[in-house]
């Protein structure tokens, strides 16, 4: 068998670090057998069999000019093997960040903090942190470690499914190359990394007969669980075309009636979502949707004032273990307490 341990990486390649002493090993001989070393394609002897170094070639303070292919020969001139030297650096700890678009799963991504120049792979795992007692943190079999399955196609990402919202996790991402391994441990709580995807299906419609109104409606992001234990709250921004500043409101449900739109101007509207108990952070903004207030006349039949404000409000049961997805939202309000001046003008 070969006296040369096979480093992780392609066969026939040996590795070293620039500026350091590098030993190359002749693979096809018995350990200690004296050999001669040559650079591939060059007749000049680099190290003879009488060096006392046996089957190894020592390169002091290797640099990039030493990279390439080497040939070793036994005393009788037989080929002992060929070795390719590749120089690079040991791994540095990768940089890791984790994010969650819902409260049941999270993903972690990583980047090398320094390029090693060598073949590199990543080992990813996680454990649930269980604190037993005041300050002690002892491992128990049920807390892992478990593998964090990596995305196919080499994307630097792994996903933890079925996470517990109230638990803490320790993510382990280890960068491995032929010169060693380096580990980044990152403590993660789902509550702090939760960032929903933006709301979907944003629509902006005029309200016939009301030249300063727009009705915006949207739906939960598809990535949010269908039977949520945790609801989302929303933030809506709107502005007239060519106007630099956004106005911001926090709607109660999945729609909002804007009552101070600028008559005749198109308005941009966007929405963002966040866990209703303020865990994590706000989502990115949804793509903007546009709408222009109605310029038409008042509808012929205006409902009585009382009917406008007596629509049933559907709210989840407080003691319900899993409130239904809040698709049943309060009915649209044509009128709103925020624009009594317009109400008087319209109803007079």
């Amino acid at each position: 068998s070969s006296p040369c341990p096979q480093a992780w990486g392609p066969p026939g390649v040996q590795y070293g670090q620039p500026g350091r002493s590098v030993k190359l090993c002749c693979p096809g001989v018995t350990a200690g057998d004296p050999v001669s070393w040559f650079r591939d394609g060059e007749p000049k002897l680099l190290q003879g069999p009488d060096s006392g170094l046996g089957h190894e070639l020592v390169l002091a303070q290797a640099d990039s000019t030493d990279e390439g292919t080497y040939i070793c020969q036994t005393l009788d001139g037989a080929l002992g093997g060929t070795v390719t030297l590749q120089l690079g650096y040991p791994p540095a700890r990768p940089v890791v960040s984790c994010q969650a678009a819902d409260y049941e799963n999270f993903s972690c991504t990583w980047s090398p903090s320094q390029i090693s120049g060598l073949p590199t792979r990543y080992l990813t795992s996680y454990r649930k942190k269980t604190v037993l007692g005041a300050d002690s943190q002892r491992r128990s079999p049920s807390t892992g470690p478990w593998p964090c399955p990596q995305d196919p196609l080499g994307a630097a990402r792994c996903v933890v499914h079925g996470a517990e919202f109230w638990s803490q996790y320790r993510i382990n991402v280890t960068e491995v190359n032929p010169l060693g391994a380096s580990t980044r441990l990152l403590d993660v709580s789902l509550q702090s990394i939760l960032r929903p995807d933006p709301p979907q299906g944003l629509r902006v419609e005029s309200v016939p007969g009301y030249p300063r109104r727009l009705r915006a409606s949207w739906t939960y992001p598809a990535s949010w669980p269908c039977q949520p234990h945790f609801l989302l709250k929303f933030r809506l921004q709107y502005r007239p075309a060519q106007h630099p500043a956004w106005s911001t409101v926090e709607p109660a449900g999945l729609e909002e009636v804007i009552t101070d739109a600028v008559a005749g101007l198109p308005h941009a509207v966007r929405v963002s979502a966040r866990d209703f108990l303020d865990a994590g952070t706000w989502s990115t903004w949804s793509p903007e949707a546009w709408g222009t207030p109605s310029t038409g006349t008042i509808p012929k039949e205006i409902p009585a004032w009382g009917q406008l404000h007596t629509q049933p409000e559907v709210e989840p049961q407080v003691d319900s273990p899993a409130p239904p997805r809040p698709s049943l939202q309060p009915h649209p309000r044509l009128l709103d307490h925020r624009d009594s001046v317009e109400q008087v003008a319209v109803l007079a």
């Epitope: 540095a92 700890r93 940089v95 890791v96 960040s97 991504t109 990583w110 980047s111 090398p112 903090s113 320094q114 390029i115 120049g117 630097a156 980044r184 990152l186």
Partner: antibody
Framework: EVQLLESGGGLVQPGGSLRLSCAAS????????MTWVRQAPGKGLEWVSS????????QYADSVKGRFTISRDNSKNTLYLQMNSLRAEDTAVYYC???????????WGRGTLVTVSS | DIQMTQSPSSLSASVGDRVTITCQAS??????LNWYQQKPGKAPKLLIY???NLQTGVPSRFSGSGSGTDFTFTISSLQPEDIATYYC?????????FGPGTKVDIK
Amino acid sequence: EVQLLESGGGLVQPGGSLRLSCAASGFTFSWYSMTWVRQAPGKGLEWVSSIVPSGGHTQYADSVKGRFTISRDNSKNTLYLQMNSLRAEDTAVYYCAKGPGWGSFDLWGRGTLVTVSS
Amino acid sequence: DIQMTQSPSSLSASVGDRVTITCQASQDINNYLNWYQQKPGKAPKLLIYDASNLQTGVPSRFSGSGSGTDFTFTISSLQPEDIATYYCQQNESQSPTFGPGTKVDIK
């Protein structure tokens, strides 16, 4: 020669913007994480922001999050810091520093002074 | 964030003296601690990395030790050119933090 050279500092009013640059030479810039560290007059060192070789991960101190943006152009061997909504407390000498790895700084520039004042 | 404290905040010693600076982290940082020297008007310079490793080209009179939360930096024989402020810095976390510094001068 291995070196880092910052530029872009100067006097700016509160609420204003400034873009710092750091030109790297003498090493393979695209292999290393890069960092901005600042030092207010007469004070200690404060880490500001770091970026990995690919630019794919960035990190910011809480004091600058949402106002500063770190970026790099590996084809130009240059690191940047875009500073918006500047405050008086951002007044400092800003140093650019190189890895190894993330969070160790074995090469520093001479620094560029940013003064935020009305 | 991990907080770093240093003591003393300043010291005066004679040429040839042994000088010791301590650094404490608010939580366990393993051995992920660096020491920097900053001379007046100059950029900082890395002296010690990973708690005890001497950076290439740094004189052997500088040394570091410690692990976990408590670390020590030593100048075995103070030289006039060592007048500077010395900072410890943790990089266990992905948000590095510096200690407040220790100013060293000659008596």
